[in-house]
Amino acid sequence: PLATIPVSTTSLTSSEGSTISTPSVDISTPVTTSIVGDQCSRCKNGGFWDGLKCQCLTPYYGESCEEVVNSIDIAPPETVSAQMELTVTVTSVKFTDELKNHSSQEFREFNKTFTEQMNIVYSGIPEYVGVNITNLRLGSVVVEHDVLLRTKYTPEYKTALDNATEVVKQKITKVTTEQIMTNDNCSALMCFNTTGTQVQNITVTQYDPVEECRQKAEEYEDYFLVEYRDQKPYCISPCESGFNASKNCNHGKCQMSQNGARCLCVTTETHWYSGEDCNQGTQKSHHHHHH
């Protein structure tokens, strides 16, 4: 069952013996009550009681899953890839029915020669992984194949793969224009029909750290953002320190609520702190204002 708990003012004692005042807010927090056996525990925000403690769902933590984490793990893939579907026409080999059978000696030999030829063609492309023949058909031999590209994930991976696909197009166009039959004979490893070269389709890995961050932040999606460090994306709230978007709470503690990040100001033995960033100090004895 869901219960509605009003959030009231609480005082937290800081490490220096000071207290943190949390003002009353007009939002209500839904509470899920999970019951396992005789043990009844209020695990909030979709968390569940495992018999010992609350198991919290992202982005929550704490004894009752009532607090919001400052950062969420997002894991971009180690590598990203692109697959290009190409067709070339090989004229230096005549088509036979055995080429349709991928376990035949004919297909294996053709595959070996074609792979060798393409490895030479694409040798200067660092993203090039290899080729995979998907189909062979009559005319002399029409080779439907995939060119596989891969690169390390960086924020600019799409540009890197897009550039690589362009170089693939240039190189295959060049080789199929230059390596052609003369007098019904081929002096190259393979010869081609220039007009038979086509790029059918290009598929690039889709990974968006911002989207993953927003999804994992759930109802806090508007307040979590992605920042990069050493080309690695971090999904952070403004309460996470050390980033451009970090909120400076000065004499206070940053806390996430459903309205965003806010500062909970400290009250020490000598001062009250207030203001949005807890940067306004009032001396208790003289009621003197500091900015």
Partner: nanobody, 123 residues
Amino acid sequence: DVQLVESGGGLVQPGGSLRLSCAASDNTFSRGSMSWFRQAPGKEREGVAIISSDGWTGYADSVKGRFTISQDNAKNSLYLQMNSLRAEDTAVYYCAASFLVLRALNPKAWHYWGQGTMVTVSS
């Protein structure tokens, strides 16, 4: 495993003739292609002649009209009849085979090779 064994090489005078033979271990190439290549000392291996299962034959320009390639599928054998031999024909002659119906005189396009037989044309 496929094996190719050449024979028929030797010493011959300029203008003379020789017939090279290549015996294949089985008839797997009867539906593909067979060829002769040669390699002169200090030079790259070059294509001499091809014969394919569809009846097509191809020759290097340097041997056209002088050399003839033929095949006997019943005997799993390939032949090269060499007439009007010249000093520049001196080389090790290799038999090569492919399961593919090839039109390529590039040695890299061929996957199966014999050990070679030496042909020396000298007076």
